[in-house]
Amino acid sequence: PPRGRILGGREAEAHARPYMASVQLNGAHLCGGVLVAEQWVLSAAHCLEDAADGKVQVLLGAHSLSQPEPSKRLYDVLRAVPHPDSQPDTIDHDLLLLQLSEKATLGPAVRPLPWQRVDRDVAPGTLCDVAGWGIVNHAGRRPDSLQHVLLPVLDRATCNRRTHHDGAITERLMCAESNRRDSCKGDSGGPLVCGGVLEGVVTSGSRVCGNRKKPGIYTRVASYAAWIDSVLA
């Protein structure tokens, strides 16, 4: 699958999501990410599929990708740890942990986000926030400033309908509605936040954006608590 999938959203309040990261390849935005510890950013494994020869860095404290901002800082990556079971051709286990070259300088615009450890589905209909620098319309325009959208969680049974994702949504994945509002190309690896807690990570599977019959797919972080803890230890 490609590296990517906010459509129908709006510009985020600057620096109101201090956990938000831009995973960059050779100085350009590649994927979203989320600061989960002082020295660790969680993203999607597929994001690095094409990055073999390039320089991967993580931008923290940013609202605009291009404009100077006092809180912005680009960190080198000391270690990239994809989930051991992630594979190029599936959306399963699409998680990646990036260890920064040093601990991030924390402040109002840079702060880790608590992540869900209780392995229980988010109730369908719950409004969750997804943010990113992914494409914002059907033309494919890429924004300079962080965008966000509120999306209702969709129950797994509906998401698994033959007309939707046809059984591909395992218990380790969750879905959100995608009727005109959706995550899209370039949002992969970014956070799905419900009630101030990280619940999901945008997967980078091949998917049309903004089509209600192709809901957004998110990796449930609670299902991977043991792996995350083992890497961060």
Epitope: R3, N137, G140
Partner: antibody, heavy 113, light 106 residues
Framework: EVQLQQSGAELVKPGASVKLSCTAS????????MHWVKQRPEQGLEWIGR????????EYDPKFQGKATITADTSSNTAYLQLSSLTSEDSAAYYC??????WGQGTSVTVSS | QIVLTQSPAILSASPGEKVTMTCSAS?????IYWYQQKPRSSPRLLIY???NLASGVPVRFSGSGSGTSYSLTISRMEAEDAATYYC?????????FGGGTKLEVK
């Protein structure tokens, strides 16, 4: 610097097919959508369709379904437009564009026996 | 499909004059793109998402509107603005263009 370089003018016979290319530099076509637009002489613009080069997903205006096929080769950073069963109605300039923001110089297709 | 009707089809304006052209949609759309095309040139994106100026576009250009009614305004016409202007909707597939407004210099 972002650039889209399109292939040269084509003179083709009715009933034949033609494949136009659009090679991008300064950005990775995987990162956005690539579109093709048709313009007949002294006429307006018509959106043919688009491709997401990252996954090959395409959408077309129904009027071009069966006439146009859009593909992409990410290894060469190139998008393609194939036009089949050509008639005089297909004589036009064809533009490729990245996210409708950056445009190629256009390729002129003339269908004539 | 959504039909976009641009008016007027042809418009003449003197340098320094304010110019407004409209784009009317057959049903409500969320946002509009505007393009400028000069003879023997490729189209150029002027305005995206109804009112945002594309990179390098002079500030004399502005866009506005909502629902079914959109407009492009040039605050002070310059000779180099002589061109054909097209609107395009990105709300509903297929993503249709208007027929264009040809702007001439008086």
């Amino acid at each position: 610097e972002v650039q889209l370089q399109q292939s040269g003018a084509e003179l083709v016979k009715p009933g034949a097919s033609v494949k136009l290319s659009c090679t991008a530099s300064g950005f990775n076509i995987k990162d956005t959508y690539m579109h093709w637009v048709k313009q007949r002489p002294e006429q307006g613009l018509e959106w043919i369709g688009r491709i997401d080069p990252a996954n090959g997903y395409t959408e077309y205006d129904p009027k071009f379904q069966g006439k146009a096929t859009i593909t992409a080769d990410t290894s060469s950073n190139t998008a393609y437009l194939q036009l089949s069963s050509l008639t005089s109605e297909d004589s036009a300039a064809y533009y490729c564009t990245s996210a409708m923001e950056f445009w190629g110089q256009g390729t002129s297709v003339t269908v004539s026996s | 499909q959504i039909v976009l009707t641009q008016s007027p089809a042809i418009l003449s304006a003197s340098p320094g004059e304010k110019v407004t052209m409209t784009c009317s949609a057959s049903s409500s759309v969320s946002y509009i793109y505007w393009y400028q095309q000069k003879p023997r040139s490729s189209p150029r994106l002027l305005i995206y998402d109804t009112s945002n100026l594309a990179s390098g576009v002079p500030v004399r250009f502005s866009g506005s509107g909502s629902g079914t009614s959109y407009s492009l305004t040039i605050s002070r016409m310059e000779a180099e603005d002589a061109a054909t202007y097209y609107c395009q909707q990105w709300s509903s597939y297929p993503f249709t263009f208007g027929g264009g407004t040809k702007l001439e210099v008086k």
